[in-house]
């Protein structure tokens, strides 16, 4: 094949390679970047800054070499259009720094950064901690700052990512308040703060206030529906992210539903309760106390973790008509008490006759003794015994 | 698998007390009720009581209420029978057994207990 | 509480007999449980629900009753069934036991 006289050049299917002297001073309009998987750059001294337009229609991009030229920043969402990429080789060139940011997302099974006169500072600590947990291939490489030595040796006691605090209301809140958070930010270096509020939804009236290092966020008219969801503070600096999550107990009535008694291995009479605290549960069958054991017990569901309501079944295990009756469930927390009640049969009770009387027995065509629809005496059965035990 | 591991043989004076621990592992300790039975030798079995470790539930036989006493710990998944003024006619093999929705589907391997002056 | 008789409290057999233990309520119960011990073992879960078989238990062992009249049936007596078996009520509080059945060969 003929030499090819362009800057960049295909390699294999979806490969390129750009290793003409100085042909490059940034990435934009590369040839079918959309399919590359590997691009190959070298010898490129104007190539100085990559940065997220450079990269942005390499998709597939798995590997990507950059060696022996001009890089001296690279930004810190420079791959945030390269979900894919693997492979991240930049030696050789004049990199002193690298943010966290640019790797944080990615899968890096390879980090090549040997022949860069990197300086030693907190914002390498992330770099740092790959060599010592031998991540990306990094320990092989044996890294140097520029007069400083190597980066194993930095110190990095007063590298920390930021603290944070957020201080929520210990007194009780109810439905209808408006409730006042404040995270407050300690740390080296601050960049960046903020809140997360996506489990809120209609949860509350949202407020931002405040900036660095103390935000401040204003939760208005607050639903039952707050309770359970996480409220979370983010602050980032050149060590890193710190995030802290907080729950707002949000103070409303106990609340029951029962349901019809199904027969799932067993029986189970399911129940819906709510209530902030989690109310206290007692049944009563037939207005008494009902005493559980290992054959009638309160089982519940898993809960789901963003919500309040517990889901269950009273269960019975062998009932019989001695179980048959009304069931009530009281479920009661400091702020309010509530009741449901349901029938259940769950066996007919063979003695519901005189005892005096013939035993009632319905026509079946195999019973050859009678040869009518009417009751027959059957005297040959053992007699059916009427006491019952109640636990 | 489901296994109850108890405790080993004990030896111990009348009006001492005992405590017999019944390990749990192959299972999800806290929905399971927790039985103990024992035997005496050469006799029947006899329900001592049942403890949910889900909400720590207890139920005893009438004739144990003031003497034995049934704990657990849900971090070890473990449950404890503890029988205190024993007399020679305590000495029985222990057993404790879960259930759920079925009877005392799983046993362990019984712990001897010997009540002697 | 409920007291659980059984009968007979032991009995001589032979292989290939047909086998049957009762158990008696002193009140009505919703079911009966069975379990087998041989010595120095713990019981075994053997019927359940009055008939339904624990597993690994042979087809030749059944259970029926209800009420306060209980059995257990073995059709064909095999070696490895001389054990003792118990009966049990799991219907109230305190729960009870039979006394026993001890399974001997003649």
């Known amino acids: 094949a003929a030499p090819c006289p362009d800057a960049c050049c295909p390699h294999g299917s979806s490969g390129l390679r750009c290793t003409r002297d100085g042909a490059l001073d940034s990435l934009h309009h590369l040839p079918g970047a959309e399919n590359l998987t590997e691009l190959y750059i070298e010898n490129q001294q104007h190539l100085q800054h990559l940065e997220l337009r450079d990269l942005r229609g390499l998709g597939e991009l798995r590997n990507l070499t950059i060696v022996k030229s001009g890089l001296r920043f690279v930004a810190p969402d420079a791959f945030h259009f390269t979900p894919r990429l693997s492979r991240l080789n930049l030696s050789f060139n004049a990199l002193e720094s690298l943010s966290w940011k640019t790797v944080q997302g990615l899968s890096l099974q390879e980090l090549v950064l040997s022949g860069n006169p990197l300086h030693c500072s907190c914002a390498l600590r992330w770099l740092q901690r790959w060599e010592e947990e031998g991540l990306g291939g990094v320990p092989e490489q044996k890294l140097q700052c520029h007069g400083q030595g190597p980066l194993a040796h930095m110190p990095n006691a007063s590298c920390g990512v930021p603290t944070l605090k957020v201080q929520v209301p210990n007194a009780s809140v109810d439905v209808g308040d408006d409730v006042l958070l404040r995270c407050q930010v300690e740390g080296r270096g601050l960049e960046q703060a903020g809140w997360i509020l996506t489990e809120l939804e209609q949860s509350a009236t949202v407020m931002k206030s405040g900036g660095l290092p103390s935000l401040g966020l204003t939760l208005a008219n607050v639903t039952s529906d707050l309770n359970r969801k996480n409220v979370t503070c983010w602050a980032e600096n050149d060590v890193g992210r710190a995030e802290v999550s907080v729950q707002v107990n949000v103070s409303f009535p106990a609340s029951v539903q029962l349901h019809t008694a199904v027969e799932m291995h067993h029986w189970c009479i399911p129940f819906s309760v709510d209530g902030q605290p989690a109310p206290s549960l007692r049944w009563l069958f037939n207005g008494s106390v009902l005493n559980e054991t290992s054959f009638i017990f309160t089982e519940f569901l898993e809960p789901a973790a963003n919500e309040t309501v517990r889901h269950g079944c009273l269960r019975l295990n062998q009932p019989t008509h001695v179980n048959n009756g009304n069931y009530t469930l009281l479920a009661a927390n400091p702020f309010g008490q509530a009741s449901a009640s349901i029938m259940a049969a769950f066996m007919d009770n063979p003695f519901e006759f005189n005892p005096e009387d013939p035993i009632p027995v319905s026509f079946s065509p195999v019973d050859t003794n009678s040869t009518s629809g009417d009751p027959v005496e059957k005297k040959d059965e053992t007699p059916f015994g009427v006491s019952v035990a109640v636990g | 698998q489901v296994q109850l591991v108890q405790s080993g043989a004990e030896v111990k004076k009348p009006g001492s007390s005992v405590k017999v621990s019944c390990k749990s592992s192959g299972y999800t300790f806290t929905n399971y009720w927790m039985h103990w039975v024992r035997q005496a030798p050469g006799q029947g079995l006899e329900w001592i009581g049942e403890i949910y470790p889900n909400n720590g539930r207890v139920n005893y036989n009438e004739k144990f209420k003031n003497r034995a006493t049934l704990t657990v710990d849900i971090s070890t998944s473990t449950a404890y029978m503890e029988l205190s003024s024993l007399r020679s006619e305590d000495t029985a093999v222990y057993y404790c057994?879960?259930?759920?929705?079925?009877?005392?589907?799983?046993w362990g391997q019984g712990t001897t207990v010997t009540v002697s002056s | 509480q409920v007291q659980l008789t059984q009968s007979p409290s032991s009995l001589s057999a032979s292989v290939g007999d047909r086998v049957t233990i009762t158990c008696s309520a002193s009140?009505?119960?919703?079911?009966m449980h069975w379990y087998q011990q041989k010595p120095g073992k713990a019981p075994k879960r053997w019927i359940y629900?009055?008939?339904k078989l624990a597993s690994g238990v042979p087809s030749r062992f059944s259970g029926s009753g209800s009420g306060t009249d209980y059995t257990l049936t073995i059709s064909s007596l095999q070696p490895e069934d001389f054990a003792t078996y118990f009966c049990q009520q799991w219907s109230s509080i305190p729960l009870t036991f039979g006394q026993g059945t001890r399974l001997e060969i003649k």
């Open positions: 009140s009505s119960v919703g079911y």
């Open positions: 057994a879960r259930s759920r929705y079925d009877p005392m589907e799983d």
């Open positions: 629900d009055t008939s």
